[in-house]
C-alpha cells in the first residue's frame, strides 16, 4: 500500500493532512519496508549477507554514503547542504535501482515499488529543497554503460551487486532518515 | 542474545571525570540501523537520556550537559565509552546504557545493561 | 526541545483492574513514541515501540495508542507484576526526552 493509503488514515478522516516532513518520513518508511522484502529474498537464495565486510568492501561499487563533510550528521549539522547530498544519493542510486529490476523472481512487484517510490521521494525532497542549483544530475550516458558492466558481470558477482545495493541503500536511507527528522 | 553490561567508578569527587565503559555482545555497532545510548536516573527519579551514538559514529547528547559529555564507540572490541567531565553531586544517579536498533530509527531501547550507581 | 509530560503522576489499582496513562508532546512526534516499565531496583524494560506496537514478549493485555501529540498505555487485567513506574519517550529526533513517569501500584 502507498505510503497516505494505509487502514489508520482511512480509519481516522478527522486527522490533519500530512504535513511535508511526515509525507517524506512516511515515503522513507515505506521504501524500507521495500528493501526489507526484498532483503529477504536475497539471503534467502543466496549466502551474502552472511559474507564479511572485508569480502564485501573489495567490491568496487561507487555507491553513495554520507560521510561527515556532508552536512547531515550532528557536528557540523548543515540543513541545505545535507539537503543537496540525500537528493543527489538518491539521484545516484537510481542507475542501481535499475538494475535490481531484473534480478528478483518472487518479488518483481517489490523491486520495482521501491524504485517508484524512490523517484516520488526525490520529487518531495526537490520541493523542500531552496538550492536545486547545487544538485548534480548524473550523466544517462555513464548509467547507460555502468548498467550495462553490471549486467554483464557473473552469477556470483551479481549476486554480490544486488546485495551490496541493497545494504548500502538501506543505510543511506536511514542516515537521510535521521538528517530530515533534525530538520 | 543481546547483553549490554556498565563498567566504571563508583565513587567520583566533585570536579573530576567519571568514565563509563558499556560492554555489549550479541550485536555489532557497525550495522546500519544500530545506536547505544546512556540514559541516567537521579535515586527516585526520573530517566534522563545523555547521549547517542550511531553505527556510522554521528553522535548526540542532551543540550543541558553537551559541554560535559564524550561518546566513543569501539565496534573491534563492542564497547562504547561515555566520560562526563566536572562531575558534581547532582550527577549522583543510576548510569544505564541500552540499545536501539530498528530499520526506522524509532530510538527505543530494546535492550539495557544493569545500571552502575555513581555517587 | 520536545517536552514530554505524563499523566497521571501515581495511580492504584486492583488485581484484575484495567488502567489507562496517557502521554503529551510539545509537539507532533507522529508515532515516534515508546512506552518503558521499570521495577524498583531494575532497569526499564521497552514495553511498546512507534505507539502502539508490543515489543516481543511483552503480554498483550498492554496496548498503546496514539499519534502526533497524544498517546496512552492501556493495561487490561492487571497482575501483581505490572506494578512499578512506566515512562513514555519520544524517539522523533534529538534530543530523546522522557515523561517523569506513572507510578503504578497493584
Known amino acids: 500500500v502507498p505510503p497516505g493509503e494505509d487502514s489508520k488514515d482511512v480509519a481516522a478522516p478527522h486527522r490533519q493532512p500530512l504535513t511535508s516532513s511526515e509525507r517524506i518520513d512516511k515515503q522513507i518508511r515505506y521504501i524500507l519496508d521495500g528493501i526489507s522484502a526484498l532483503r529477504k529474498e536475497t539471503c534467502n537464495k543466496s549466502n551474502m549477507c552472511e559474507s564479511s565486510k572485508e569480502a564485501l568492501a573489495e567490491n568496487n561499487l561507487n555507491l553513495p554514503k554520507m560521510a561527515e563533510k556532508d552536512g547531515c550528521f550532528q557536528s557540523g549539522f548543515n540543513e541545505e547542504t545535507c539537503l543537496v547530498k540525500i537528493i543527489t544519493g538518491l539521484l545516484e542510486f537510481e542507475v542501481y535501482l535499475e538494475y535490481l529490476q531484473n534480478r528478483f523472481e518472487s518479488s518483481e512487484e517489490q523491486a520495482r515499488a521501491v524504485q517508484m517510490s524512490t523517484k516520488v521521494l526525490i520529487q518531495f525532497l526537490q520541493k523542500k529543497a531552496k538550492n536545486l542549483d547545487a544538485i548534480t544530475t548524473p550523466d544517462p550516458t555513464t548509467n547507460a554503460s555502468l548498467l550495462t558492466k553490471l549486467q554483464a558481470q557473473n552469477q556470483w558477482l551479481q549476486d554480490m551487486t544486488t546485495h551490496l545495493i541493497l545494504r548500502s541503500f538501506k543505510e543511506f536511507l536511514q542516515s537521510s532518515l535521521r538528517a530530515l527528522r533534525q530538520m | 542474545q543481546v547483553t549490554l553490561k556498565e563498567s566504571g567508578p563508583t565513587l567520583v569527587k566533585p570536579t573530576q571525570t567519571l568514565t563509563l565503559t558499556c560492554s555489549f555482545s550479541?550485536?555489532?555497532?557497525?550495522?546500519?540501523?544500530?545506536?547505544v545510548g546512556w540514559v541516567r536516573q537521579p535515586p527516585g527519579k526520573a530517566l534522563e537520556w545523555l547521549a547517542f551514538?550511531?553505527?556510522?559514529?554521528?553522535?548526540y547528547y542532551s543540550p543541558s550537559l553537551e559541554s560535559r559529555l564524550t561518546i566513543t564507540k569501539d565496534t573491534s572490541k563492542n564497547q562504547v565509552v561515555l566520560t562526563m567531565t566536572n562531575m558534581d553531586p547532582v550527577d549522583t544517579a543510576t548510569y544505564y546504557c541500552?540499545?536501539?536498533?530498528?530499520?526506522?530509527?524509532?530510538?527505543?531501547?530494546?535492550?539495557w545493561g544493569q545500571g552502575t550507581l555513581v555517587t | 526541545d520536545i517536552q514530554m509530560t505524563q499523566s497521571p503522576s501515581s495511580l492504584s489499582a486492583f488485581v484484575g483492574d484495567g488502567v489507562t496513562m496517557t502521554c503529551w508532546a510539545s509537539?507532533?512526534?507522529?508515532?515516534?513514541l515508546n512506552w518503558y516499565h521499570q521495577r524498583p531496583g531494575e532497569a526499564p524494560e521497552l514495553l511498546v515501540f512507534?505507539?502502539?506496537n508490543l515489543q516481543i514478549g511483552v503480554p498483550s493485555r498492554f496496548r498503546g495508542s496514539g499519534s502526533e501529540t497524544y498517546f496512552t498505555l492501556t493495561i487490561n487485567s492487571l497482575q501483581p507484576e505490572d506494578s512499578g513506574t512506566y515512562f513514555c519517550?519520544?524517539?522523533?529526533?534529538?534530543?530523546?526526552?522522557f515523561g517523569g513517569g506513572t507510578k503504578l501500584e497493584i
Open positions: 541500552a540499545r536501539s536498533a530498528d530499520d526506522y530509527l524509532y530510538y527505543s531501547f530494546d535492550t
Open positions: 519517550q519520544h524517539g522523533h529526533s534529538f534530543p530523546l526526552t
Open positions: 550479541g550485536f555489532s555497532l557497525s550495522t546500519s540501523g544500530v545506536g
Open positions: 509537539q507532533s512526534i507522529n508515532d515516534y
Open positions: 551514538i550511531f553505527w556510522d559514529d554521528d553522535k
Open positions: 512507534a505507539a502502539s
